[in-house]
């Protein structure tokens, strides 16, 4: 069976029907359907006016405008808001009421596309394998990234979050139109990785998506990840404005000027520095989502009531931090180079700036405890990777799972750890699953491009597709049309259960309490440490006229803008040419390993940069307020509260081992989410809902943080912060 031309709100579209084998099964593929009008720089997306005739939807459209990997030119287009659909078909009748899975790509909110990198004439985010193996409809789409997607003045002049609104437009388009393709508009599952996983999380928390999303999967990124929310957008907006010659003294004039500046110039005005980094690379990524008082009405930690009816899977890779650790400390991947205590202490201190000497020393001691018994280089290098994995991915994900569980009504919660080791040949043998290593298995690459994969890789891919698509169908990864290797139990705050995904899975794959000691350290001990003053904590930004974006000082005061905790991390753009530089980490949607770089350049493989990892920017919140639920001090690691946030957050009391959302106060009650008075009522975007207002305009260096529901005034968040 095949669909033929399909009528959508924009008009008729016609895709391609691809036959699969001799049994008569096929897949209808639609590429390049517009879901919004061509974008205007730094404006919200607008509906597409539609077209006459039948749109031939047979080729992927260009990605949204972004810098190339060398950051010296751009590619993509401003006219980029298009989506792609894969619909599996049986032999006889066209499909009806299929579950729908919408993929959101990663790439540090800086790069990427809905189709991903091309390898062996197969795109990374080609939905065919998931669609046909799982009998679901797969949708991928483009959204704006970098300055064009996320530049914000922190006020109504340029509220930001344009890329998130693009994502919402795509989700809403699917809701309105997918029935015509054979999908069930009441069974939509979002899934995404890295910045895409964080985006999935943010979309479930936004009141704009009320009623649109049934289930969600966050892979290596959640709304609470420290690199997801930009607390000082004005700092970054001014950096770009200065670069393109716009006035910075008045926010309104600056905004007007930025809107009429050549979008390519805006894109190139922001560069992630590549060498001589004084701080961890992820401190330098600035254009990520913000708390705008509307689309994201409050600190994400306070919005979990909005996801109370959405089934949720979240997880990480066991060495998600490897790519970032290897950028921050290149010795990690070099057998002939050593990691010293001094190196690690320096790294730790850069991640714990606002907790000063005590923060650095305590954290260092906790992580190096095993070094006395095992001083081997392998152990030390693994420690560095574990440290960045914990801070950037694992701890925030655990907190998100606990928040979801604590707020859920009927919704189910599941956790996983992906541990199938990286296929990157240049990595040491001890390296586990690096950031973005999971993507290729979810998208069935071992089946689509069998060359270079082993039977065990197909086993992993088959299992992941089965769990993911069963979950999309029923809300339970064990139940659906696909057999699974072992039973995946739900996550609860009592058991902290998670499924470890490996090549051999059985009943022992269901585990409990992942890295509990470290989780407890970050959410309890570390948070309780006093925050040092701005003067003590503020690093001196690099001087001179270098192209590199200076690291903004930490702190929240006028003089000390919050450090770019921001966005993530596209890992640094690799050196061009055939320098002996180590392989560039996975970039955006590059191809998850083992996919080497596309093109026939002799460049070393570009590992996937999923998206990722900017430094932990905590949710803003009501910081100093004691036991308000995991507000703020959720525990998003290690970015301690900066500036004069007031007294350090009061850590949750009680020594129960049920982090990461420990009960507030000493009561055993789960955290109360301050969303109005009904537990489930989503925080509305407008009105006097209590959602914080869009912060006032003005020219202060630090963008005002809108107050959250129960704060008396806009204080610094109580989540850990650099």
């Amino acid at each position: 069976a095949k669909l033929g031309a399909v009528y959508t709100e924009g008009g008729f579209v016609e895709g391609v029907n691809k036959k699969l084998g001799l049994l008569g099964d096929s897949v209808d593929i639609f590429k390049g359907i517009p879901f919004a009008a061509p974008t205007k720089a730094l404006e919200n997306p607008q509906p597409h006016p539609g077209w006459q005739g039948t749109l031939k939807a047979k080729n992927f459209k260009k990605r949204c405008l972004q810098a190339t990997i060398t950051q010296d030119s751009t590619y993509g287009d401003e006219d980029c808001l298009y989506l792609n659909i894969w619909v599996p078909q049986g032999r006889k009748q066209v499909s009806r009421d299929l579950p729908v899975m919408i993929w959101i790509y990663g790439g540090a909110f800086l790069m990427g596309s809905g189709h991903g990198a091309n390898f062996l004439n197969n795109y990374l985010y080609d939905g065919e394998e998931i669609a046909t193996r799982g009998n679901v409809i797969v949708v991928t789409f483009n959204y704006r990234v970098g300055p064009l997607g996320f530049l914000s003045t922190g006020d109504a002049n340029l509220p930001g979050n344009y890329g998130l609104r693009d994502q919402h437009m795509a989700i809403a388009w699917v809701k309105r139109n997918i029935a015509a393709f054979g999908g069930d508009p009441n069974n939509i599952t979002l899934f995404g990785e890295s910045a895409g996983g964080a985006s999935v999380s943010l979309q479930t928390l936004s009141p704009y998506n009320k009623g649109l999303i049934r289930r969600a999967i966050s892979q290596s990124g959640v709304a609470l990840s420290p690199w997801v929310i930009q607390k000082n957008p004005l700092f970054w907006a001014k950096k770009v404005a200065e670069k393109v010659g716009c006035p910075v003294g008045d926010a309104a004039r600056m905004a007007q000027c930025l809107k009429v500046t050549d979008p390519r110039a805006l894109t190139l005005a922001y560069k992630v520095p590549l060498a001589g980094l004084e701080y961890p690379m992820l401190h330098y990524v600035g254009f990520v989502p913000v708390i705008d008082g509307d689309f994201i009405p409050a600190d994400p930690i306070n919005l979990y009531a909005n996801a109370a009816d959405i089934d949720y899977i979240a997880g990480t890779n066991n060495m998600d931090g490897h790519i970032f650790a290897s950028i921050d400390m290149p010795a990690i991947n070099k057998g002939n180079k050593k990691v010293t205590e001094e190196d690690f202490y320096k790294l730790v201190s850069e991640f714990t700036i606002t907790k000063g000497l005590r923060g650095a020393k305590t954290t260092f001691d906790v992580y190096t405890e095993s070094w006395a018994q095992d001083p081997s280089q392998e152990n030390k290098k693994k420690t560095v990777v574990d440290f960045e994995t914990d801070v950037l991915f694992l701890v925030p994900t655990e907190i998100a799972l606990a928040q979801h569980r604590a707020n859920a009504k009927s919704a189910k919660t599941y956790a996983y750890l992906f541990s199938h080791p990286s296929r990157m040949p240049v990595y040491p043998k001890w390296v586990g699953a690096d950031h973005a290593d999971d993507i290729q298995y979810v998208f069935g690459k071992p089946f689509a491009t069998p060359t270079g994969y082993r039977p065990q890789d197909r086993t992993v891919s088959k299992a992941m597709i089965a769990y993911w698509t069963n979950f999309a169908k029923t809300g339970d990864p064990n139940m659906g049309d696909s057999a699974v290797p072992t039973h995946w139990e739900p996550y609860t705050t009592e058991n902290s259960g998670y499924l470890e995904i490996t090549k051999k899975m059985g009943s022992s794959s269901m585990k409990r309490s992942l890295r509990t000691n470290f989780l407890r350290y970050w959410t309890l001990t570390y948070l309780a440490l006093p925050t040092v003053t701005d003067q003590e904590a503020t690093p001196v930004p690099p001087t001179g006229d270098s192209e590199a974006t200076p690291v903004p000082p930490t702190g929240d005061s006028e003089t000390a803008p919050v450090p770019p905790t921001g966005d993530s991390g596209a890992p640094p753009v690799p050196p061009t040419g055939d320098s002996g530089a180590p392989p560039v980490p996975p970039t955006g949607d590059s191809g998850a390993p083992p996919v080497p770089p596309t093109g026939d350049s002799g460049a070393p493989p570009v590992p996937p940069t999923g998206d990722s990892g900017a430094p932990p920017v905590p949710p803003t919140g009501d910081s100093g307020a004691p036991p308000v639920p995991p507000t703020g001090d959720s525990g998003a690691p290690p970015v301690p509260p900066t500036g004069d946030a007031g007294p350090p957050p009061v850590p949750p009391t009680g020594d129960s081992g049920a982090p990461p959302v420990p009960p507030t106060g000493d009561s055993g009650a789960p955290p109360v989410t301050p969303t109005g008075d009904s537990e489930t009522a989503p925080v509305p975007p407008t009105g006097d809902s209590g959602a914080p207002p869009v912060p006032p305009t003005g020219d202060s260096e630090a963008a005002p943080v809108p107050p959250t529901d129960d704060s008396k005034e806009a204080q610094m968040p109580a989540v850990i912060r650099f």
Partner: antibody, heavy 119, light 105 residues
Framework: QVQLVQSGAEVKKPGASVKVSCKAS????????MHWVRQAPGQGLEWMGV????????SYTQKFQGRVTMTRDTSTSTVYMELSSLRSEDTAVYYC????????????WGQGTLVTVSS | DIQMTQSPSSLSASVGDRVTITCRAS?????MNWYQQKPGKAPKLLIY???SLPSGVPSRFSGSGSGTDFTLTISSLQPEDFATYYC????????FGQGTKLEIK
Amino acid sequence: QVQLVQSGAEVKKPGASVKVSCKASGYTFTSYNMHWVRQAPGQGLEWMGVINPGDGATSYTQKFQGRVTMTRDTSTSTVYMELSSLRSEDTAVYYCARDYYGSSPLGYWGQGTLVTVSS
Amino acid sequence: DIQMTQSPSSLSASVGDRVTITCRASPSISYMNWYQQKPGKAPKLLIYAASSLPSGVPSRFSGSGSGTDFTLTISSLQPEDFATYYCQQRSSSPTFGQGTKLEIK
């Protein structure tokens, strides 16, 4: 100017079929989608489906799937809507309507055709 | 299917009055169109894409809104404006609101 002229009123018995025509003039026939909308006596408007006169592609709302067929004749710039297995509740005025621009605002309407289903 | 709730279902007003009709969509929609229908006649497009006026429609008609809430406003009612008004959402299966009958007070 754009004109859509529909065929005359029809009286049909339950179980029968009816075929209503809509002749277009004043524009390039194959360039704009044509929709069919019906209105039962004293009731609101109900969208039935759409045809692209250029390639004949059609889409029908779920309610009429299997009972409605929309066709076109490019030589006479006419679209047709056939509704089968008629029941008394199909008694209504049937309108053809052309897209205004882009998609979906129905900018030009025929005068309507009353179809009465009665035994 | 997308649900359209139009209110009020009927209203009485006088010439010169300002009149507002609302239409709520669930879930959110991209565009809203408004039509005017007089007894025994075909509907006429009044507003498209939430706020745009086709040529020939008087400027006293205006539309606003986005997402879920949309409004049709007639700034100063004229005798010829007494009719039934319908909103219509655009999706793969367009639907109309149930109509608002505007009568002379």
